[in-house]
């Protein structure tokens, strides 16, 4: 247990005095006290010093020292009085809220213990306390109104006799809240129900309250049902249960069921919907587009919503190609139940590889048959570019091949000097090829386009660059003619090809 110095339960000082409170423990220690000004805190290992060199009436209060690391939670306390002849009270809170029959502490702290004999509690405007107000006083804590009643919600003042006259504290507003047990608590089970015509069903409506005076009923589409009631009392609560048993459901049993309970405080109601169907059903849907495009290397979650009754007998994800015969790993498939008849199935495809593009199908089966939902996944690639010099129909031609997805656009640049990449200042000419020739365009593959630039004579101190870009990125290839022939430069940066 921590030790406080000075080792006295109470300390009485005058305003302006210097006060030093030292707490020593086995481990680190903490101070707790009323929020007040002018305190300085020094901590040094296992001791903590709280000090002020200008004590005021607002420093009046109990200062407690605790050792947070102590499993027994030991603490020590000292009460400080700063006896100000003009201020007999230090009020720690101007509003106190309690429930009926709780004790209400009005925290007006006496600043001088000598005044204790002449204290009293009054209502504001000099009004006496209401009759039957049972209260006590502690100079350390203030006035406690015992088992407070709603009618004691008043504005109070603490009064002390000083030199034959009554000196009042600032007012403290007491709010005594009524404890009104509300309407009974309700449960309606199940929250949703689906049955095939001819099957059995059960709906249970139950209500509970601390008071026996309440009613409960079950209604179907606003018609009150005549159901025998079971009553019970446990956990200090009265329970009333209505159970609707249907041996063979038909369409007229479908609809909204409400469980309603009421007492003098009001009523509560909760509802559920009962669906009667002709036969088993299985519906698959997705909030996502069934045609997906994702950049290579990124991830994708494919989600399927399943609505089914009766429950699923089996389900799986299948990869339908075209790249390989690999199947999704079971650990990447996830199922969550939204409620009894609705489920969400997710296939996680992290860091997609080129061979993972293609069709993914979710299959599910229940007594109503089987259904499938298929996603088409196309991967996006930044363009890859290559340039060669050739002769077509006798004309010197630069041939640029660009491959990527979506289909790349092609731009040719001619710039001065020999460079790996044309820079704005060097550009002499720019040609956009709005319609490059598509060499290949198969589903789930990259699109390869070809652009031709006919050059009558290659200028040797110049660079010809083919640039391709799409929504994912860009690629380029610089062609540098040299006297011994032609020289090509792919860009400096390494193009990542998964």
């Amino acid at each position: 247990i921590p030790v406080i110095e000075p080792s006295v339960p109470e300390l009485v000082v005058k305003p302006g005095a210097t006060v030093t409170l030292r707490c020593v423990g086995n481990g680190s220690v903490e101070w707790d006290g009323p929020p007040s000004p002018h305190w300085t805190l020094y901590s040094d290992g296992s001791s903590s010093i709280l000090s002020t060199n200008n004590a005021t009436f607002q420093n009046t209060g109990t200062y407690r020292c605790t050792e947070p690391g102590d499993p027994l939670g030991g603490s020590a306390a000292i009460h400080l009085y700063v006896k100000d002849p003009a201020r007999p009270w230090n009020v720690l809170a101007q509003e106190v809220v309690v429930f009926e029959d709780q004790d209400a502490l009005l925290p007006c702290l006496l600043t001088d213990p000598v005044l204790e004999a002449g204290v009293s509690l009054v209502r504001v405007r000099g009004r006496p306390l209401m009759r039957h107000t049972n209260y006590s006083f502690s100079p350390w804590h203030g006035f406690t109104i015992h088992r407070a009643k709603f009618i004691q919600s008043q504005d109070y003042q603490c009064s002390a006799l000083m030199g034959g006259r009554k000196v009042m504290s600032i007012s403290i507003r007491l709010k005594v809240q009524k404890v009104i047990p509300g309407p009974p608590a309700l449960t309606l089970v199940p929250a949703e129900l689906v049955r095939i015509r001819g099957e059995a069903a059960q709906i249970v409506c139950s209500a509970s309250s601390v008071d026996v005076n309440f009613d409960v009923f079950l209604q179907h589409n606003n018609t009150k049902l005549a159901i025998p009631q079971q009553s019970d009392f446990h956990n200090n609560r009265y329970q009333k249960v209505l159970t609707l048993n249907l041996d063979q459901v038909d369409f007229q049993h479908a609809g909204n069921y409400s469980c309603v309970a009421s007492n003098v405080q009001g009523k509560h109601s909760t509802s559920m919907f009962f669906r009667v169907v002709e036969s088993a059903y299985l519906n698959l849907s997705s909030e996502q587009n069934l045609i997906q495009e994702v950049t290579v290397g990124e991830g994708l979650n494919l989600k399927v919503m399943v609505e089914a009754y009766p429950g699923l007998q089996g389900f799986n994800w299948t990869y339908l190609g075209p790249f390989s015969d690999h199947q999704p790993e079971p650990k990447l498939a996830n199922a969550t139940t939204k409620d009894t008849y609705r489920h969400t199935f997710t296939l996680s495809l992290p860091r997609l590889k080129p061979s993972e593009a293609g069709r993914y199908s979710f299959l599910a089966r229940n007594p109503g048959g089987w259904r499938a939902l298929t996603f088409e996944l196309t991967l996006r690639y930044p363009p890859e570019v290559s340039v060669i010099w050739t002769f077509i129909n006798g004309s010197g031609t630069l041939l640029c091949a660009a491959s990527g997805y979506p289909q790349p656009n092609v731009t040719w640049l001619q710039c001065s000097g020999h460079t790996d990449r044309c820079d704005e200042a060097q550009v002499l000419q720019v040609w956009d090829d709005p319609y490059p020739e598509v060499l290949s365009q198969e589903p789930f593959h990259k699109v390869t386009v070809q652009s031709l630039l006919t050059v009558e004579t290659l200028e040797h101190n110049q660079t010809y660059e083919c640039r391709a870009h799409n929504s994912v990125g860009s690629g380029s290839w610089a062609f540098i003619p040299i006297s011994a022939g032609a020289h090509t430069h792919p860009p400096d940066e390494f193009l990542f090809t998964p």
Epitope: R125, S153, D155
Partner: antibody, heavy 119, light 107 residues
Framework: QVQLVESGGGVVQPGRSLRLSCAAS????????MHWVRQAPGKGLEWVAV????????YYADSVKGRFTISRDNSKNTLYLQMNSLRAEDTAVYYC????????????WGQGTTVTVSS | DIQMTQSPSSLSASVGDRVTITCQAS??????LNWYQQKPGKAPKLLIY???NLETGVPSRFSGSGSGTDFTFTISSLQPEDIATYYC?????????FGQGTRLEIK
């Protein structure tokens, strides 16, 4: 000086709604509990509802529970009474009144506003 | 709910008379009772709080007494301006209830 002025009364058909207002001036409205009290023609006083100074607690007479709602806007120094599903027996002069040091002494009253529920 | 029964429902007295009105609660309400005055066509006015305390600014000819279930309101010397209806009001718990009122007239 301390003043409460009610408004919003009038003639209304049964089943309809009406909203009464009470504008306060001359005192710190946000420190006072506020009541609505009504007086049917030729009859005595009937307490209707009370709201605590901060709006945290509201209580109603059984005759209006579930139909009337007391509220306040301390920034506008105004008290309200929203009256729904009005009945002929709600016909009365409606007074707002303030409670200073507790929630029961109605020490300042407005002049009243008349509500007539008739088809 | 606790009922408040005021009597008489009306009375006639002469200027200078001592007038007494009683209010009876159906259960013990301690001293949780107020008295109000309502002049014709006007709003009520608080006269006595906590059964026997005179509200600030109210003439000393008005007084109240009683505790538990029986309460008395007295005008020691009736004045012409005292013509009004007087109501008792209990506030020991909710709902707050008023007596049915006593109409005071001058003979």
């Amino acid at each position: 000086q301390v003043q409460l002025v009610e408004s919003g009364g009038g003639v209304v058909q049964p089943g309809r709604s009406l909203r009464l207002s009470c504008a306060a001036s001359g005192f710190t409205f946000s420190s006072y509990g506020m009541h609505w009290v009504r007086q049917a023609p030729g009859k005595g006083l009937e307490w209707v509802a009370v709201i605590w100074y901060d709006g945290s607690n509201k209580y109603y007479a059984d005759s209006v529970k579930g139909r009337f709602t007391i509220s306040r806007d301390n920034s506008k120094n105004t008290l309200y009474l929203q009256m729904n599903s009005l009945r002929a027996e709600d016909t009365a002069v409606y007074y707002c009144a303030s409670s200073s040091s507790n929630f029961y002494d109605m020490d300042v009253w407005g002049q009243g506003t008349t509500v007539t529920v008739s088809s | 709910d606790i009922q408040m029964t005021q009597s008489p429902s009306s009375l006639s007295a002469s200027v200078g008379d001592r007038v007494t009105i009683t209010c009876q609660a159906s259960q013990d309400i301690s001293n949780y009772l107020n008295w109000y005055q309502q002049k014709p066509g006007k709003a009520p006015k608080l006269l006595i709080y906590d059964a026997s305390n005179l509200e600030t600014g109210v003439p000393s000819r008005f007084s109240g007494s009683g505790s538990g279930t029986d309460f008395t309101f007295t005008i020691s010397s009736l004045q012409p301006e005292d013509i009004a209806t007087y109501y008792c009001q209990r506030y020991d718990d909710l709902p707050i209830t008023f007596g049915q009122g006593t109409r005071l007239e001058i003979k």
